[in-house]
């Protein structure tokens, strides 16, 4: 019973988890235009990882996307890469999860296949939520970086003979949305992974029998018998994925200004 | 598009009047109301903004004593309300609908409000 | 408060000149989020309001006649009238819309000889 509620859980956890990722992947709220400085403009931007958006005071607002793919920071294509990987993991362990359920019989499929399907599915999430929470954090860190570097130049002059005022952009609440789903993801790809262990068959060890030879007596008492699981001394598909394989190699220098318009 | 404001006012200095500006022919909830005061032979100054849906409120620093923007969206008008009045006060107030670029798209015909003993 | 001043003060032409007017900000009203320059033309006649002549320093309010162009960017902005006629006697204002309070400029008036 507790293995099925774990099981579920997982399985609810992970889903709001995958939804969130979905929604902040697509949300235009990347980073906002910090304000704390500079309350007094009648134009809010923000960005998301598709397009940026212009909110004028008087309602409109005009959102364009960033219709080239070779001009864009390498950062943000690194970004976008990992959100739809975890988004794409995450709907792949959603599949397989649903068919592990223990609360749903398909056929005649052992505990052990289920066993199995839980614990790929239960690892396709953490590594989802992993990608999503990396993605979430590479933007966020690029944010950080370009704040500051705006900041020390806030007001730079054509020659120094302009002020024009620099946008400076903070958090936007996509990230929030995104590091919360990812933890989510994450939790419910534990709680996956707990839940195949109960699943797996228990070790069934047989009480001795005597056997009564004519003659003499003679018991005979066999080891405990071990089912093959993969978790026992039979490993013969233990490693069943092997998440983490993650290169770094995209990520280069990226331009000062969080402007891809 | 039109934007109809009350006519002109003769008031006392010291005391209060309240300017209106109906609107027709377009969403009244869907845009800005802004406010603008001209002086006799002067320039344009911005007064400030309401936002019929919400009710919420931008004010030019200058007018936030003086004025007080409302609006009612059953009846589709604005209303703005000067206190204390003193002859500076003396002026046409003209209501605009905010269009793109944050400009004032429609104007009202405006309302000559004169301060005098 | 961001100061608009406009040049000349006045101007008189005759119909069917050019005429240029300046409008010149104390800050850039350029955008970095979407590159358009906050900035506003109105024309007002005797004895009426404003009418809106451009937005975004150079898009044409629909209806304005294709001899009103606004351009410029960053703090310095132009409004052209490529042939004046009777009817463009009027001050003329440009009002930045990107900093609030939003402020005007003081008129350049056009009359015509």
């Known amino acids: 019973m507790a293995v099925t509620a774990c099981q579920g859980l997982g399985f609810v956890v992970s889903l709001i988890g995958i939804a969130g990722i979905i929604a902040a992947t697509c949300m235009d709220q990347w980073s906002t235009q910090d304000l704390y400085n500079n309350p007094v403009t009648a134009v809010f931007n923000y960005q998301g990882l598709w397009r940026s958006c212009v909110r004028e005071s008087s309602g409109f607002t005009e959102c364009r996307g960033y219709f080239t793919l070779l001009g864009l920071p390498a950062m943000l294509q690194a970004v976008r890469a990992l959100m739809i990987v975890g988004i794409v993991l995450g709907a792949i362990g959603l599949l397989v999860s649903i068919f592990a359920l223990k609360c749903i019989r398909i056929g005649s499929m052992e505990d052990s296949a289920k066993a199995n399907m839980t614990l790929t599915s239960g690892i396709m999430f953490i590594v989802s939520g992993l990608c999503a929470i990396a993605g979430v954090s590479v933007f966020a860190n690029m944010l950080v970086t370009n704040f500051w570097m705006s900041t020390a130049n806030m007001y730079t002059g054509m020659g120094g003979m302009v002020q024009t005022v620099q946008t400076r952009y903070t958090f936007g609440a996509a990230l929030f949305v995104g590091w919360v789903a990812g933890g989510l993801t994450l939790i419910g790809g534990v709680m996956m992974c707990i839940a195949c262990r109960g699943l797996a068959p228990e070790e069934t060890n047989y009480k001795a029998v005597s056997y009564h030879a004519s003659g003499h007596s003679v018991a005979y008492k066999p080891g405990g018998f071990k089912a093959s699981t993969g978790f026992g001394s039979n490993t013969k598909n233990k490693k069943i994925y092997d998440g983490g394989a993650r290169t770094e190699d995209e990520v280069q220098s990226y331009p000062s200004k969080h402007d891809y318009v | 598009v039109q934007l109809q404001e009350s006519g002109a006012e003769l008031v006392r200095p010291g005391t209060s009047v309240k300017v209106s500006c109906k609107a027709s022919?377009?969403?009244?909830?869907?845009?800005?109301i802004e406010w603008v005061k001209q002086r006799p032979g002067q320039g344009l100054e911005w007064i400030g903004m309401i936002n019929p849906g919400s009710g919420g409120t931008h004010y030019n620093e200058k007018f936030k004593v003086k004025a007080t923007l409302t609006a009612d969206k059953s009846s589709s008008t604005a209303y703005m309300q000067l206190n204390s009045l003193t002859s500076d006060d003396s002026a046409v107030y003209f209501c605009a609908r905010g269009g793109f670029g944050n400009s004032f798209a429609y104007w009202g015909q405006g309302t000559l409000v004169t301060v005098s003993a | 408060d961001i100061m608009m001043t406009q040049t000349p003060l006045s101007l008189t032409v005759t119909a069917g000149e050019k005429v240029t007017m300046s409008c010149k900000s104390s800050q850039s009203l350029l955008n970095g989020g979407n590159l358009k320059n906050y900035l506003t033309w109105y024309q007002q006649k005797p004895g009426q309001p404003p009418k809106l002549l451009t937005y975004?320093?150079?898009t044409r309010e629909s209806g304005v006649p294709a001899r009103f162009t606004g351009s410029g960017s960053g703090t310095d902005f132009t409004l052209t009238i490529s042939s004046v006629q009777a009817e463009d006697l009027a001050v003329y204002y440009c009002q930045n819309g990107y900093f609030y309070p939003y402020t005007f400029g003081g008129g350049t008036k056009l009359e015509i000889k």
């Open positions: 975004w320093a150079s």
């Open positions: 022919r377009y969403a009244f909830t869907n845009y800005l």
